[in-house]
């Protein structure tokens, strides 16, 4: 066979679908690899061919499109399962070709089982809601294209195992779930089950996402440096170890990069000759506010080091701040020589 541009196994698109549910999988060639779409390719006389390799097998085989009730079918650039079975798991390849052109890509498809509470090995998308921020909503994901707009599906929302009913701050509104006020207690996994009819059969789509309630932008502040501060003086003798923590609080900000760094005499520690090490630790609050601590350490400090300026800097999308540590050389205690004058007197 003539040469084919092989894009290999596209593990970036690890597709997971639930057992016994419909699945529609678009050929990734047109989405990520080629500069033209399926319609253009089709009108240019190119044919899309599908085949697969079963799990734990090496043999590529054609997909059986003659199963009862058209369980697996192809429509344009979409491979349809109505519904999936557990043993559909494997690597699927779509190949676009004619007599002079060939391009193909493979991708893994995993058919996943779920329990009655929607627990499964499925990787869940995370949706962040701002705490106490007014009405916010989540939308049942990845259900487009499964049924025409003329079909009115029924949608049931669950939090964990429980149908959302008698929840006074959450309103199911069809494909949307509206949070009148998001609280920490709203953290958890939310599942929408979409039920729709097709050709006399009833299909279910199950979609689960994780809701994480995070700090609100209306409460966000620039970074706050808790240490160093004006109340603590780092007083050392030459030869001792100097440890200065820089502890910074960052409000949660969506997509903000939080940075902490030290400067010594205005330079980054990497750019000066003294033997300094910096260790960083990060902790998060329940609403994903962040506290970063960078400990600056000089094992054996010199009198020169104790004259330097040590400044902690912090930056987020809300602004930049800096604070100098108060470092000084310990003054040796004066040595008193006690002279005892002994007088012997006689009465």
């Amino acid at each position: 066979s003539e040469r084919c541009d092989d894009w290999g196994l596209d593990t970036m698109r690890q597709i997971q679908v639930f057992e016994d549910e419909p699945a529609r999988i678009k050929c990734p060639l047109f989405e990520h690899f080629l500069k033209f779409n399926y319609s253009t390719a089709h009108s240019a006389g190119l044919t899309l061919i599908w085949y697969w390799t079963r799990q734990d097998r090496d043999l590529e085989e054609p997909i059986n499109f003659r199963l009862p009730e058209n369980r697996i079918s192809k429509e344009k650039d979409v491979l349809w399962f109505r519904p999936t079975l557990l043993n559909d798991t494997g690597n699927y390849t779509c190949m676009l070709r004619n007599t002079t052109y060939c391009s193909k890509v493979a991708f893994p498809l995993e058919v996943v089982q779920k329990d009655s509470c929607f627990n499964s090995p499925m990787k869940l998308p995370v949706h962040k809601l701002y705490i106490e921020y007014g009405i916010q909503r989540i939308t049942c994901p990845n259900v487009d294209g499964y049924f025409p707009s003329s079909v009115k599906p029924t949608i049931t929302w669950y939090m964990g195992c429980y149908k959302i009913q008698n929840f006074n701050n959450v309103i199911p509104e069809g494909m949307n779930l509206s949070f009148l006020i998001a609280l920490i207690s709203n953290n958890g996994n939310y599942t929408c089950v979409v039920t729709y009819p097709e050709n006399g059969r009833t299909f279910h789509l199950t979609r689960t996402l994780t809701v994480k309630v995070v700090g609100s932008p209306k409460n966000a502040v620039p970074p706050v440096i808790h240490s160093p501060n004006d109340h603590v003086v780092y007083e050392k003798e030459p030869g001792e170890e100097l440890l200065i923590p820089c502890t910074v609080y960052f409000s949660f900000l969506m997509d903000s990069r939080n940075e902490v760094w030290w400067t010594i005499d205005g330079k980054k520690p990497d750019d000066i000759t003294i033997d300094v090490t910096i260790n960083e630790s990060i902790s998060h609050s329940r609403t994903e506010d962040e506290t970063r601590t960078q400990i600056l350490s000089i094992k054996k400090v010199t009198s020169e080091d104790l004259k330097r300026s040590y400044v902690c800097h912090a930056r987020s999308a809300k602004g930049e701040v800096a604070k100098a540590a108060k470092v000084k050389q310990k003054v040796p205690a004066p040595r008193y020589t006690v002279e005892l004058a002994c007088g012997f007197g006689a009465t």
Epitope: E132, G134, I135, Q136, R137, Q165, N166, F167, N168, N169, V170, I171, P172, E173, G174, S178, L180, I181, L183, S185
Partner: antibody
Framework: QEQLVESGGDLVKPEGSLTLTCTAS?????????ICWVRQAPGKGLEWIAC???????TYYPNWAKGRFTISKTSSTTVTLQMTSLTAADTATYFC????????????WGQGTLVTVSS | ALVMTQTPSPVSAAVGGTVTINCQAS??????LAWFQQKPGQPPKLLIY???TLASGVPSRFSGSGSGTEFTLTISGVQSDDAATYYC???????????????FGGGTEVVVK
């Protein structure tokens, strides 16, 4: 047993102000409840005025009530409704109700307090 | 804004008969609807929430159905004690305005003969 009791209803002159109080017994507003005010003019239907979420003090009002009515939680057992620029159209029995914004099985109503606006 | 329209009013029924009250929402409120019963001089009493869930202690002769914009309260085997005014209450959110609508229908009086 859980109860809501409204108080503060009175005869008030047009353009006057009045504050109504809703007092809970048998439960406290430190839990997550919507406490709402609803009114009913004599011989007429029910009309929603305001709601407050008791654990966060978040409030919602219909557009017509914004600015003239203010709902507040004043203690762990009391919610008030401040009313200003009153007119004869505000004459009604004012009810306080629990979990009415999103109606749940925890819905509970007080007996109401009568407000009359007349010169 | 959300408008809830109740029909008919008044409605009369014989003891043992069936009464159907309709409530129409001006926009899709899914299943976010409750039904209340009110007798003269009393506060409203919750009968049904979530369009079809019977509140605790409410007799099973009351039932609710519908979703979207059309809702129905049915009283099967009407009793004289069911003479009252019935209200529907719909709720929906407007995320663009960070607002919500909590609107009562105009009420339907049920007369039992």
């Amino acid at each position: 047993q859980e109860q809501l009791v409204e108080s503060g209803g009175d005869l008030v002159k047009p353009e006057g102000s009045l504050t109504l109080t809703c007092t809970a017994s048998g439960f406290s507003f430190s839990s997550n409840y919507w406490i709402c005010w609803v009114r009913q003019a004599p011989g007429k239907g029910l009309e929603w005025i305001a709601c407050i979420y008791t654990s966060t003090d978040t409030t919602y009002y219909p557009n017509w009530a914004k600015g003239r009515f203010t709902i507040s939680k004043t203690s762990s057992t009391t919610v008030t409704l401040q009313m200003t620029s009153l007119t004869a159209a505000d004459t009604a029995t004012y009810f306080c109700a629990r979990d009415l914004l999103v109606v749940t099985s925890f819905n509970l109503w007080g007996q109401g307090t009568l407000v009359t606006v007349s010169s | 804004a959300l408008v809830m329209t109740q029909t008919p009013s008044p409605v009369s029924a014989a003891v043992g008969g069936t009464v159907t009250i309709n409530c129409q929402a001006s926009e899709d409120i899914y299943s976010n609807l409750a039904w209340f019963q009110q007798k003269p001089g009393q506060p409203p009493k919750l009968l049904i929430y979530g369009a079809s869930t019977l509140a605790s202690g409410v007799p099973s002769r009351f039932s609710g159905s519908g979703s979207g914009t059309e809702f129905t309260l049915t009283i099967s085997g009407v009793q004289s004690d069911d003479a009252a005014t019935y209200y529907c209450l719909g709720v929906c959110t407007d995320i663009s305005a960070d607002d919500l609508y909590n609107t009562f229908g105009g009420g339907t009086e049920v007369v039992v003969k």
